[in-house]
């Protein structure tokens, strides 16, 4: 069947999700598309516990997550509600800074070296994290 009951090779299972951590960089949209071709999405952080898990695996390196405001409001790529959800921005962020000289503001969110979030130019080639959820059907405990 099409159900994903265990994580693919080279992915890490945590709390019923599978995570894959890149060691090279891409622009945000290319990283997002890469994850989608893996039947996944850029990581969506929904709790402090998940934040710490991801932070542990990526280390002090700028890393894309599945959060952007390219169409106006901030949105998670899987539809998770931004306004009521977990947030971990650095102080004064997001600031949609235009001073970088690359044109436009900053529309894509990434983990910074201390794990807190910043908005940045989406074309920057940062590392990224893919996430896919294990199927609900596979979460039932086996019958004894």
């Amino acid at each position: 069947g099409s159900e994903r009951t265990c994580c693919p090779v080279n992915w890490v299972e945590h709390e019923r999700s599978c995570y894959w951590f890149s060691r090279s960089g891409k622009a945000w949209a290319d990283a997002d598309n890469y994850c989608r071709l893996e039947d996944a999405h850029l990581v969506v952080v929904t709790s402090w516990e998940e934040q710490k898990f991801v932070q542990h695996h990526i280390g002090p390196v700028n890393t894309w997550m599945g959060l952007h405001d390219q169409n106006g409001p901030w949105k998670w790529v899987d539809g998770t509600d931004y306004e009521t959800g977990f947030k971990n921005w650095r102080p004064e962020q997001p600031d949609d800074w235009y001073g970088h000289g690359l044109g436009g503001g900053e529309d894509c969110a990434h983990f910074t070296d201390d794990g807190r979030w910043n908005d940045d130019v989406c074309q920057r080639p940062y590392r990224w994290v893919c996430e896919t959820e294990l199927d609900k059907a596979s979460q039932e405990p086996p019958l004894l």
Epitope: P8, S24, G25, K26, D30, Y34, R36, L37, E38, P125
Partner: antibody
């Protein structure tokens, strides 16, 4: 041995339709994103379309967007390309290929032998 | 979109020659660069992925190098079976996997 075998090519008039198939064997088909790549006579390679392993995500080149649709049936280990509104410039050998993803890099590591599509009146 | 160019478009060489083909991207693609070999009437074959990683079963006389925008495929000692057309491909811009125009290697 991993193999891909295309079929469904042939001669079609401009504006017509064709459906290409690609039968996979020797590897876990559903674990790989699959792609179509074409090559016009005497020309280079052009990426056409790609679909994720479970079929939930698809992308196509601008040159075929809205006309060609990629799909797959993992229960049959088969990849498809539905080609509508065919044009003379679609004349090419069409290859299916599997996408290898290693440490963030991607490549097409298994290729079929190709099927020829000719669009002419 | 990222455009790929190759040079030369064709070259003539002798058995045992060291041959180099260059590929250039219109903007930086880090190490997201593959090389393929294609013989007439046959499907392409993956030789090298991620700039320098040799695909399983490919002879060690093939090697790849480069980074950023400029890349090179080198055949250290050309063999009769190496006469073919070689294509580079960028995969930085997922999924717009653009190929170069090809370099044809034939017998001098």
């Amino acid at each position: 041995e991993a193999q891909l075998l295309e079929s469904g090519g042939g001669l079609e008039q401009p504006g017509g339709s064709l459906r290409l198939s690609c039968a996979a064997s020797g590897f876990t088909f559903s674990s790989y994103a699959m792609s179509w790549v074409r090559q016009a006579p005497g020309k280079g390679l052009e990426w056409v379309s790609v679909i994720s392993g479970r079929g939930g995500n698809t992308y196509s080149a601008d040159s075929v967007k809205g006309r060609f649709t990629i799909s797959r049936d993992n229960s049959k280990n088969t990849l498809y390309l539905q080609m509508n509104s065919l044009r003379a410039e679609d004349t090419a050998v069409y290859y299916c290929a599997s996408r290898l993803a290693v440490a963030g890099s991607e490549a097409f590591h298994i290729w079929g032998q190709g099927t020829m599509v000719t669009v002419s009146s | 979109d990222i455009q790929m160019t190759q040079s030369p478009s064709s070259l003539s060489a002798s058995i045992g020659d060291r041959v180099s083909i260059t590929c250039r991207a219109s903007r930086t693609i880090n190490n997201y660069l593959n090389w393929y070999q294609q013989k007439p009437g046959k499907a392409p074959k993956l030789l090298i992925f991620a700039t320098s990683s040799l695909q399983s079963g490919v002879p060690s006389r093939f090697s790849g190098s480069g980074s950023g925008t400029d890349f090179t495929l080198t055949i250290s000692s050309l063999q009769p079976e190496d006469f073919a057309t070689y294509y580079c491909q960028q995969t930085y811009s997922t999924p717009l996997f653009a190929f170069g125009p090809g370099t044809k290697v034939d017998i001098k």
